[in-house]
Amino acid sequence: AMDLILINSLPLVSDAETSLTCIASGWHPHEPITIGRDFEALMNQHQDPLEVTQDVTREWAKKVVWKREKASKINGAYFCEGRVRGQAIRIRTMKMRQQASFLPATLTMTVDRGDNVNISFKKVLIKEEDAVIYKNGSFIHSVPRHEVPDILEVHLPHAQPQDAGVYSARYIGGNLFTSAFTRLIVRRCEAQKWGPDCNRPCTTCKNNGVCHEDTGECICPPGFMGRTCEKACEPHTFGRTCKERCSGSEGCKSYVFCLPDPYGCSCATGWRGLQCNEACPYGHYGPDCKLRCHCTNEEMCDRFQGCLCSQGWQGLQCEKEGRPRMTPQIEDLPDHIEVNSGKFNPICKASGWPLPTSEEMTLVKPDGTVLQPNDFNHTDHFSVAIFTVNRILPPDSGVWVCSVNTVAGMVEKPFNISVKVLPEPLHAPNVIDTGHNFAIINISSEPYFGDGPIKSKKLFYKPVNQAWKYIQVMNEIVTLNYLEPRTDYELCVQLVRPGEGGEGHPGPVRRFTTASIGLPPPRGLSLLPKSQTALNLTWQPIFTSSEDEFYVEVERWSQQTRSDQQNIKVPGNLTSVLLNNLLPREQYSVRARVNTKAQGEWSEELRAWTLSDILPPQPENIKITNITDYTALVSWTIVDGYSISSIIIRYKVQGKNEDQHIDVKIKNATITQYQLKGLEPETTYHVDIFAENNIGSSNPAFSQEIRTLPAPKDLGGGKMLL
């Protein structure tokens, strides 16, 4: 699938600019193409690295340009290499001095195994010296000085693959830089044969195409295309699909084209000579002008295309009548396709005449793998090839090429495939809450591995050992209803991205168990302080109809420090628990439930303070109001948390002894007012108020002073003083 072309312009080096251009036509290499010196062919050449640049006129091309440098830097053998599926395709060529003593008849020569071969060099300088011929740098033959002919030849009566190599000729007094080079290519097989055992017949390659001994395909000369190289390109174009163009003012003049072995090098159609700068004489056409026109009806002979057939005629000599051939065209293939990884069935559709057959349609992956159709059908106007990729993966992303190669020509259409990784959640869904018949799930679709966008989500669930069910979900929080109590369930999430086969692999599985239908909480719950560090929780005895063992779970936590939480399991036959190791003067919350294998229902929350470790603070907001002649209303507030058990109101008449006071003890700390009664009218009292807890009494800072009102006049007929 790699169409690699090396243009050597020019192979004979003088003091003019010279170049090598390597083109990967219609092929998008993963690895860059390289141009280098071919030391295998010629050891003693310049060692300097080549200055390889991108050919800006083409997308996939590299170039080396020598601008009138000393010719010793240029003389030698070169290669262009492209790699596909780890295999290298290497094209070789050579450059030599125009002033060499001999010049080769051709830059390369391709022969079949067993051919009778003459490798020839033309003498261009006459010297009184022996002529010597080398193969791959080793001496093979010499001609005494008086016998050096005008055409120096190496004769191989029965060429074998081991005869292949670079042959060079020079006078004995010369050196590498006065040597002429030619490369002999010997096909592994005899003429018209290919295959590992050379027993398969080659397609007849027209127009000097060469049958590849490993594939049986024709390597077409520059200027021809198609399965048999019968189709001529438009003038000045080349490449397997004739898409490349010679940019020179005279087309492909002075371009020597080198193609993969066993083709070797030749001029483009219409040109000949070592420098490809001589036009074909009339009646000749093709690469190196080696083909002759024998047009049946005396049609015009074009040096680029051969016989120009009139309407209704075709064939190399216009000898066939019938419907004219039409170069295949690829139809309805988008430039870009986004594909989900997994099974993929790309389709190639082509028109043309004759209609392409199944064998003539291929699909080339970015790594160079060539796929043959799995299924094929055609209508009157189109051939449709369906290919199967059992498992397409992201590394398969890149430029794929649909290729159609018929006798009527060849066409390739590249298109970009972007293979997406199916999304998969990284985490299992989280079970937020469960009951005996429901579960609240956070499906945790983010983060996920793979490619978005996420089109939809499915939550799969099932009781263990049963089949999966799923629900389509939109939100992250989902409630599953109608579950079975006391059942093990499995959950996982599948993410779906757009496109066919967009369902990702389900993510990790979460297991959970639904609750049993639970018992009610203990009755008669009471929470009371026991000490500064303990509270006592009590409840009524528990009787259940179930035979399952049960226990009371008590959960307590501090209102101040929420983190201080503890769960205590209490055997079911007990009716109290001492919650100890608590902090003094701290309020705790407690709740309880009765659990079997299933968890019971929680009780309401109870709160209590542990006993204080300090004296209580004075009651606050002390007010004495509603004073009459013998009553007064005392009110106050107390601060929570000091285990205040009682409030003491102490009052005495002003001026009386300290011990003549009256104490009123209010044992219910929730009471916040008290009416003093039996006071004397028009009397001043000192009133103190204390809070009392397990440590002692508070210290009042000052006494309140009140004066009762005068007694009301007796209007009931008593004596009146005037």
Epitope: S72, F139, N175, L176, F177
Partner: antibody
């Protein structure tokens, strides 16, 4: 006109150093291997060192190995011989010579310079 | 190292004489192909040497045809078929089969 011109010779004390140069003209310098050959007064020729066209291959006579260094600058068309730790027996006329080959094989020296005299004496 | 021995070390000849100089090597100079890795040089007093013959028998460019080289293996000969006045000089053989390249000690051809 094809020619080689040596320079840099002279009188030097034993243990001293000297650098000889050979300027080439009239031919494509970097097409050929180059050599230094010396001749002690009244004696025969002795090959000293050779260097291939691209400096890829360099060889020395045992008598100078480790003391002399041959090099070339193709951009300047010049051959050099750096001579260190000179001894009295290094006294000679030093010729630079062009090979007909590009490598150090099948050598033949078809162009010679006029020579430069190096005298090592205290 | 390959030792090169020339004989005679000197000789006298008259103009027109045929002169033969012999060079013997301590090992064969014949390469795997048919060429011998031996060169002949001529040196005149106060001048640089001049290449006469390379690879045993190939005359260098501009060298008169009266000079010829022959021999193979270890025994080589330089022949001047008819010596001329300008040919009176010292002649050296040099082996190029392996480094170090080594010269013969020279043969001085003088006018009788």
């Amino acid at each position: 006109e094809v020619q080689l011109v040596e320079s840099g010779g002279g009188l030097v004390q034993p243990g001293g150093s000297l650098r000889l140069s050979c300027a080439a003209s009239g031919f494509t310098f970097d097409d050929y291997a180059m050599h230094w050959v010396r001749q002690a007064p009244g004696k025969g020729l002795e090959w000293v060192a050779g260097i291939s066209w691209n400096s890829g291959s360099i060889v020395y006579a045992d008598s100078v190995k480790g003391r002399f260094t041959i090099s070339r600058d193709n951009s300047k068309n010049t051959l050099y011989l750096q001579m260190n730790s000179l001894r009295a027996e290094d006294t000679a006329v030093y010729y630079c010579a062009k090979d007909i080959r590009e490598q150090l094989v099948e050598d033949a020296f078809d162009i010679w310079g006029q020579g430069t005299l190096v005298t090592v004496s205290s | 190292d390959i030792q090169m021995t020339q004989s005679p070390s000197s000789l006298s000849a008259s103009v027109g004489d045929r002169v033969t100089i012999t060079c013997r090597s301590s090992q064969s100079l014949l390469h795997s192909h048919r060429y011998n890795y031996l060169d002949w040089y001529q040196q005149k007093p106060g001048k640089a040497p001049k290449l006469l013959i390379y690879l045993g028998s190939n005359r260098a460019s501009g060298v008169p045809s009266r000079f010829s080289g022959s021999g193979s293996g270890t025994d080589f000969t330089l022949t001047i078929s008819s010596v001329q006045p300008e040919d009176f000089a010292t002649y050296y053989c040099m082996q190029t089969l392996q480094t170090p390249l080594t010269f013969g000690q020279g043969t001085k051809v003088e006018i009788k």
